[in-house]
């Protein structure tokens, strides 16, 4: 049984969490995105998504990096930093981000109902949309035997909190910072369980550009610990299709 929690798409980028914990390897991340008719996002694609409102509090794979996109500073998400926050010592399992080129250019919260590129298999795969709607199918998407039959399985009660609970690695981070934020209360954050993450700020800038390029700091992996992903909202399928929903 595999549960895949997914978010709205922002400029085609979305977050996928497997079984409610950090449990995806880099090879599985690529396979999972492929199953969603998607690819691992590039840094440029992630930065575009960030610039139109995409943020999470979870480490996830993109092409070449493990990142958390942050708009609003929060002490428990990416060490209070904003921008695309890069974890430089990525030696463990994380969530993943995916990019679907067929998604609309800004926010798309229509429900994803299946894994179009999954192949035949015995696994019950449940896609859980942000509003809790669930779509179940049998199949498989993993191609790496180590992902299907891991030699050291992830313990079920680990990594729903901070990733430092299962990794003693203390590594550096690189993050891209963006312009100033102005606090207002967020009204609904069903994905976020830690109450300290319920009062993010909001941006009123139209676009964001790295201020002074990249900045480097150091810390532990414990920054992205909130169980859940995108902050706020709900989604269901409704009405006539304007652009292709993902997956196609």
């Amino acid at each position: 049984q595999i549960d895949l929690n997914i978010t709205c798409r922002f400029a085609g980028v979305f977050h996928v969490e497997k079984n409610g914990r950090y449990s995806i390897s880099r090879t599985e991340a690529a396979d999972l995105c492929k199953a969603f008719n998607s690819t691992l996002p590039t840094m440029a694609q992630m930065e575009k998504a960030l610039s139109i409102g995409f943020e999470t509090c979870r480490y996830g794979f993109i092409e070449g990096h493990v990142v958390i996109p942050r708009i609003h500073p929060n002490s428990i998400c990416a060490a209070n930093n904003t921008g695309v926050y890069i974890l430089t010592s990525n030696t463990s399992q994380y969530d993943t981000y995916c990019f679907n080129a067929s998604a609309p250019p800004e926010e798309d919260c229509t429900s994803v109902t299946d894994l179009p590129n999954a192949f035949d298999g015995p696994i019950t795969i449940t896609i859980v949309n942000r509003d809790g709607t669930r779509y179940v199918q049998k199949g498989e998407y993993r191609t790496n035997p180590e992902d299907i039959y891991p030699s050291n399985p992830t313990d079920d009660d680990v990594s729903s909190g901070s990733s430092s609970e299962r990794s003693s690695t203390s590594g550096g981070y690189i993050f891209y910072t963006f312009s100033t934020v102005h606090p207002i209360p967020d009204e609904d954050s069903p994905w976020i369980t830690d109450s300290t993450d319920r009062i993010p700020a909001t941006r009123d800038q139209d676009t964001f550009h790295p201020s002074g390029g990249s900045h480097t700091t150091h810390g532990s992996e414990s920054d992205g610990h909130s169980h859940g992903s995108q902050e706020g909202g709900a989604n269901t399928t409704s009405g006539p299709i304007r652009t292709p929903q993902i997956p196609e």
């Epitope: 409102g53 708009i71 609309p104 926010e107 229509t110 954050s189 706020g232 006539p240 299709i241 304007r242």
Partner: antibody
Framework: EVQLLESGGGLVQPGGSLRLSCAAS????????MNWVRQAPGKGLEWVSS????????KYADSVKGRFTISRDNSKNTLYLQMNSLRAEDTAVYYC??????????WGQGSLVTVSS | DIQMTQSPLSLPVTPGEPASISCRSS???????????LDWYLQKPGQSPQLLIY???NRASGVPDRFSGSGSGTDFTLKISRVEAEDVGVYYC?????????FGQGTKVEIK
Amino acid sequence: EVQLLESGGGLVQPGGSLRLSCAASGFTFSNYTMNWVRQAPGKGLEWVSSIVSSGGFTKYADSVKGRFTISRDNSKNTLYLQMNSLRAEDTAVYYCARGWSSQPAIWGQGSLVTVSS
Amino acid sequence: DIQMTQSPLSLPVTPGEPASISCRSSQSLLHSNGYNYLDWYLQKPGQSPQLLIYLGSNRASGVPDRFSGSGSGTDFTLKISRVEAEDVGVYYCMQALQTPWTFGQGTKVEIK
């Protein structure tokens, strides 16, 4: 039926405040980025502000930045525009509009805001 | 921001005759998903704008088939195959590729 209904417009003095509301029905409000667009008398259309589905990310036109605040209450299916420090040039019909996402944009009928002494 | 330019700004028409309005954007509105994020609206006197065409060429629900949209990238056209009296008003093109939404100046269509 998909519907957006604006309210809260009226006559206000320069420097004053007003809050517009937009009640949504007939669709899943919490799925959509929402927008405010305005039209000054005899003029064209001007986008004012937008807010993503969660309410956690907003954008504003330069002409209203720092004076207007967009917000939403997904539990009430309602969009708001708080307008402070109003100026004569803010006089317009204000439309709330559903973002396009995977479906065509939907507009309300508009609410007239007149800023005059 | 993406700039939108419409022409002509005024279009006197004869009922039963065709009419055409042009819209040009300062950057391509063709998204990687293959759709052009260009909408056409008609604002009749005293009314709110009503959607005619979305994604460049898709007629909105309830819009008569005499209206058609075409074009790709930066150049778009709205055509009315046979103008009727009820088609008078101001026509706007709008780009929906990115926020801020931006609009053409409007084309006023009136009966000769």
